[in-house]
């Protein structure tokens, strides 16, 4: 029961984390104009991984995509790559972990297979979380470095935009979303790895029992067997769960509304 709870909770935490990583990657507020020393501008600048935006006090907001790949700073490209790798690994991890969930039965999948899948998804979540944390941290470091270097007509690390004297950038909301989401994905991954240990069936070693036959004294020492394998003559020890037979036509996957974003 505790294993199922740990696995289920790990899955949910990772799901929230990956959703957060996706949200952070798409957000425009990775860096926002620093207003601490300059609250008097009627224009607010903020930038994301994919575009930069300007919000005027009149309410008009204009966003421009970075329509160049080669012209962008290597660090920005690296952050993009880390976030995308994190999302891809996380998505695969989620897919694998769905099938690994103890509460979900797929055919006659063995517990050992579920344990392996749980471990695999756990490792994927850990790497995914680390990618997100690394990506956000690299960007944050880039901001700190550029903060004191924002001088007139200087190209900063934020998408190669020309900065005027008064425009400095500080941490945007996306950085905090990314850090929290990466942390959650990491925690979820650790929980999945812990759950994996509980899922992996331990070898049951039966104590030797002496059978005294007439004329011979033969000791039978049955070797330890995996309770879940169902191999050999010990199948009577294993409960077989029949999930119900289904034809191929019955097992359909319906597209969700999120398949066509």
């Amino acid at each position: 029961m505790a294993v199922t709870a740990c696995q289920g909770l790990g899955f949910v935490v990772s799901l929230i984390g990956i959703a957060g990583i996706i949200a952070a990657t798409c957000m425009d507020q990775w860096s926002t104009q620093d207003l601490y020393n300059n609250p008097v501008t009627a224009v607010f600048n903020y930038q994301g991984l994919w575009r930069s935006c300007v919000r005027e006090s009149s309410g008009f907001t204009e966003c421009r995509g970075y329509f160049t790949l080669l012209g962008l700073p290597a660090m920005l490209q690296a952050v993009r790559a880390l976030m995308i790798v994190g999302i891809v690994l996380g998505a695969i991890g989620l897919l694998v972990s769905i099938f690994a969930l103890k509460c979900i039965r797929i055919g006659s999948m063995e517990d050992s297979a579920k344990a392996n899948m749980t471990l695999t998804s756990g490792i994927m979540f850990i790497v995914s979380g680390l990618c997100a944390i690394a990506g956000v941290s690299v960007f944050a470091n880039m901001l700190v470095t550029n903060f004191w270097m924002s001088t007139a007509n200087m190209y900063t690390g934020m998408g190669g935009m020309v900065q005027t004297v008064q425009t400095r950038y500080t941490f945007g909301a996306a950085l905090f979303v990314g850090w929290v989401a990466g942390g959650l994905t990491l925690i979820g991954g650790v929980m999945m790895c812990i759950a994996c240990r509980g899922l992996a069936p331990e070898e049951t070693n039966y104590k030797a029992v002496s059978y005294h036959a007439s004329g011979h004294s033969v000791a039978y020492k049955p070797g330890g067997f995996k309770a879940s394998t169902g191999f050999g003559s010990n199948t009577k020890n294993k409960k077989i769960y029949d999930g119900g037979a289904r034809t191929e036509d019955e097992v359909q996957s319906y597209p969700s509304k999120h398949d066509y974003v």
Epitope: V40, T41, V43, V54, E56, S58, M161, Q166, T167
Partner: antibody
């Protein structure tokens, strides 16, 4: 065409207060800022402040923070500016305008002449 | 506050002539985020409210005749009327839309001979 209709001319005593109205029509009132501008006879333009009719948020020119109070009534699509403790320096034409691109003032009311005289 | 200095204070021209007027800002009005200059030009005819001509220094407002052209960047801006018409008799103001409080230039009075 966007319209901003301001209240009529006011003749007021020094030390009293006056409330100028600006009724907006033919656009979504809550989607645009309303700005207020002062113009003394034969003089240039001075920005008083702005109000976001949607949220009620305001931003004032420090010079007019004590003098002017900006409000808006969403139900009647009307913005108001109250001027208090009036002196002869406050005698001017007051314009309301709708905010536009580039923090410009795209549409203007016809102006309200406020005369402070004993 | 940002000081906008307009010159000349007044100018008298004949119809059909080309006119240029200047507006100098005490600080750069260029925003690095979108590389736009937050300077606006208005025309105010006698007894009327001001009318928007250009915003972002050079973007002409819809309905404004093409003879009006705004230009410049940073601190130096110009409004050009390619061929002055009689109806262009007015005072022209520039406005800072980048820093609070918004400020206006003193105006350039255009008179027709």
């Amino acid at each position: 065409e966007v319209q901003l209709q301001q209240s009529g001319a006011e003749l007021v005593r020094p030390g009293t207060s006056v409330k100028v109205s600006c009724k907006a029509s033919r656009y979504a009132f809550t989607n645009y800022l309303i700005e207020w501008v002062k113009q003394r006879p034969g003089q240039g333009l001075e920005w008083i402040g702005m109000i976001n009719p949607g949220s009620g948020g305001t931003h004032y020119n420090e010079k007019f923070k004590v003098k002017a109070t900006l409000t808006a009534d969403k139900s009647s699509s009307t913005a108001y500016m109250q001027l208090s403790s009036l002196t002869s320096d406050d005698s001017a034409v007051y314009f309301c305008a709708r905010g536009g691109f580039g923090n410009s003032f795209a549409y203007w009311g016809q102006g309200t002449l406020v005369t402070v005289s004993a | 506050d940002i000081l906008l200095t307009q010159s000349p204070l007044s100018l008298t021209v004949t119809a059909g002539e080309k006119v240029t007027m200047s507006c100098k800002s005490s600080q750069s009005l260029l925003n690095g985020g979108n590389l736009k200059n937050y300077l606006t030009w208005y025309q105010q005819k006698p007894g009327q409210p001001p009318k928007l001509l250009t915003y972002w220094a050079s973007t002409r407002e819809s309905g404004v005749p093409v003879r009006f052209t705004g230009s410049g960047s940073g601190t130096d801006f110009t409004l050009t009327i390619s061929s002055v018409q009689a109806e262009d008799l007015a005072v022209y103001y520039c406005q800072n839309g980048y820093f609070y409080p918004y400020t206006f230039g003193g105006g350039t009075k255009l008179e027709i001979k």
